[in-house]
C-alpha cells in the first residue's frame, strides 16, 4: 500500500484523516451529552485509487472488479484502520456519569 | 440499526452482502494461482442511509455530520463487517501449495 | 475503577527542585477529554490548582509559579510528572493529581505530604 | 484570574437540616462550575459538575444550582457523614481556581 502522501489524483485527496469541528448540536448529541460542547471529529475522507492504503486481499479484489465493472461494483471506501478512545460526560437520571467510547474517533484511515 | 431488509430506498438496494462471479483473469491472479479458475467473490455493496447497519458510533457520527456537510463528510459505505476464509492453489518455484487467505471474501457487512 | 497515587521525596530544602509522579490506572491519557492536573492543599487552607496537561500534550499552568513549573507525562506507563524549581519553604503542602475531564477533577489520588524545610 | 470566594468559612447545622453553601464568582462563567467534598483527613472527592449535576453515587441529598456569577451547594436532611469541607471550582478559562472552602459542622 502506498503511503499517504503518494496519492496519484494530487496532495490530499486520497484517503486520508481530516478534523471535522462539530458541536453536540451538529452530532445529535445535545440532549444526552454534557460535554465537551464541541468535539474535535476525526475521520476517513478520501479517494482509494488503485492499491492505495489498501486494507487486505479484499481491497484488492474489489479494486480489480471495481476497473472491470464500475457499474456494479464500487470502488474501495476510505475508512478507519483504528480508532482513538473518546471520554463524554453523559447526562443520566440523576445527573452525570463518565464515559469512554473506543470507537467514535478514527485514528488512522485504509481503503476496503 | 435496522435489519438488512428493512431498506429505506427500497428492497436489496441497501448496504448488503453481493456475489460476483470472477475469473482468474480477472482478478489479475493468473500467474500466482492455479485453483480455483473462477471465484464467487461475497463483497458489501449497497447504501448506507441513515443508522442503517451503522456499524459503531463513529458511523453514526459519520450520518449526521453528512447530514449537515454533505459536500465535506462523505456518507457511511457499505463494507465487511467479516470475512471468510478461502484457500488457493498457488503456484511455487517448485510446483504448488495450498494457502488459506483470512481476508479475501466478505462474510457480512455493515456501514463505517 | 479509576486509581491515582502521587508519590515524591517527602522532604527536601529551600531552592531545590521537587520532583513529583501521579501513577494512575483505570483510565488512559491517549483518551480525548482526558487530563490528569496537580492540586496542592498547604495544611488547614484551600485547594490550589498548578498544572494540568491533556491527551493531546497541551499544557496549563498557574500563572503566578508558571515559571517554576514543569509538567509532563508518559502515557504508555501511566504516569504524570510535576517538576517545581526554587522549592521554599511557601511551598509546603500536600501535593494532589487528579483525573480531569474537561475542567473538572473527577477522580483524586490520596496525596503526597512534602515539606520543605533548611 | 477570576477569584471564587465562598464567603462563609464554617457552616453548623444539626442532622436532618437543610444547608445552603453558597459561592460567587469575580466574571460570568456560565454554569462552569464544580463543587467537591473533603473530608477530615482525606482527598477531595467530586460532588457535582456544570453547577447542577450530580456525579454518579452522589447521594440526592446534595443539590447544585446557580450560573453567571453565583453559585449554590445545597445538602438536604443533612447526614453525620456529611461533616467535610465543601469547596466550589470554576473551569470556564485558565488558571482554573478554587473557593476558599466552606467547613460544615455538626452541632
Known amino acids: 500500500a502506498r503511503n499517504g502522501d503518494d496519492c496519484p489524483l494530487g496532495p490530499g485527496r486520497c484517503c486520508r484523516l481530516h478534523t471535522v469541528r462539530a458541536s453536540l448540536e451538529d452530532l445529535g448529541w445535545a440532549d444526552w451529552v454534557l460535554s465537551p460542547r464541541e468535539v474535535q471529529v476525526t475521520m476517513c475522507i478520501g479517494a482509494c485509487p488503485s492499491q492505495f492504503r489498501a486494507a487486505n486481499m479484499h481491497a484488492q479484489i474489489k479494486t480489480s472488479l471495481h476497473r472491470l465493472k464500475p457499474d456494479t461494483v464500487p470502488a474501495p471506501c476510505c475508512v478507519p484502520a483504528s480508532y482513538n478512545p473518546m471520554v463524554l460526560i453523559q447526562k443520566t437520571d440523576t445527573g452525570v456519569s463518565l464515559q469512554t467510547y473506543d470507537d467514535l474517533l478514527a485514528k488512522d484511515c485504509h481503503c476496503i | 440499526a435496522r435489519n438488512g431488509d428493512d431498506c429505506p430506498l427500497g428492497p436489496g438496494r441497501c448496504c448488503r452482502l453481493h456475489t460476483v462471479r470472477a475469473s482468474l483473469e480477472d482478478l489479475g491472479w493468473a500467474d500466482w494461482v492455479l485453483s480455483p479458475r473462477e471465484v464467487q467473490v461475497t463483497m458489501c455493496i449497497g447504501a448506507c442511509p441513515s443508522q442503517f447497519r451503522a456499524a459503531n458510533m463513529h458511523a453514526q457520527i459519520k450520518t449526521s455530520l453528512h447530514r449537515l456537510k454533505p459536500d465535506t463528510v462523505p456518507a457511511p459505505c457499505c463494507v465487511p463487517a467479516s470475512y471468510n476464509p478461502m484457500v488457493l492453489i498457488q503456484k511455487t518455484d517448485t510446483g504448488v501449495s495450498l494457502q488459506t487467505y483470512d481476508d479475501l471474501l466478505a462474510k457480512d457487512c455493515h456501514c463505517i | 475503577q479509576v486509581t491515582l497515587k502521587e508519590s515524591g521525596p517527602g522532604i527536601l530544602q529551600p531552592s531545590q527542585t521537587l520532583s513529583l509522579t501521579c501513577s494512575f490506572s483505570?483510565?488512559?491519557?491517549?483518551?480525548?477529554?482526558?487530563?490528569v492536573g496537580w492540586i496542592r492543599q498547604p495544611s488547614g487552607k484551600g485547594l490550589e490548582w498548578l498544572a494540568n496537561?491533556?491527551?493531546?500534550?497541551?499544557?496549563y499552568y498557574n500563572s503566578a509559579l508558571k515559571s517554576r513549573l514543569t509538567i509532563s507525562k508518559d502515557t504508555s506507563n501511566n504516569q504524570v510528572f510535576l517538576k517545581i524549581s526554587s522549592v521554599d519553604t511557601a511551598d509546603t503542602a500536600t501535593y494532589y493529581c487528579?483525573?480531569?475531564?474537561?475542567?473538572?477533577?473527577?477522580?483524586w489520588g490520596q496525596g503526597t505530604l512534602v515539606t520543605v524545610s533548611s | 484570574d477570576i477569584v471564587m470566594t465562598q464567603s462563609q468559612k464554617f457552616m453548623s447545622t444539626s442532622v436532618g437540616d437543610r444547608v445552603s453553601v453558597t459561592c460567587k464568582a469575580s466574571?460570568?462563567?456560565?454554569?462552569?462550575v464544580a463543587w467537591y467534598q473533603q473530608k477530615p483527613g482525606q482527598s477531595p472527592k467530586a460532588l457535582i459538575y456544570?453547577?447542577?449535576y450530580r456525579y454518579s453515587g452522589v447521594p440526592d441529598r446534595f443539590t447544585g444550582s446557580g450560573s453567571g456569577t453565583d453559585f449554590t451547594l445545597t445538602i438536604s436532611n443533612v447526614q453525620s457523614e456529611d461533616l467535610a469541607e465543601y469547596f466550589c471550582?470554576?473551569?470556564?478559562?485558565?488558571?482554573?481556581?478554587f473557593g476558599g472552602g466552606t467547613k460544615l459542622e455538626i452541632k
Open positions: 483505570g483510565f488512559s491519557l491517549s483518551t480525548y477529554g482526558m487530563g
Open positions: 466574571q460570568n462563567v456560565g454554569t462552569n
Open positions: 471550582q470554576q473551569y470556564n478559562s485558565y488558571p482554573l481556581t
Open positions: 487528579a483525573q480531569e475531564v474537561y475542567g473538572w477533577f473527577a477522580y
Open positions: 456544570s453547577a447542577s
Open positions: 496537561i491533556w491527551w493531546n500534550d497541551d499544557k
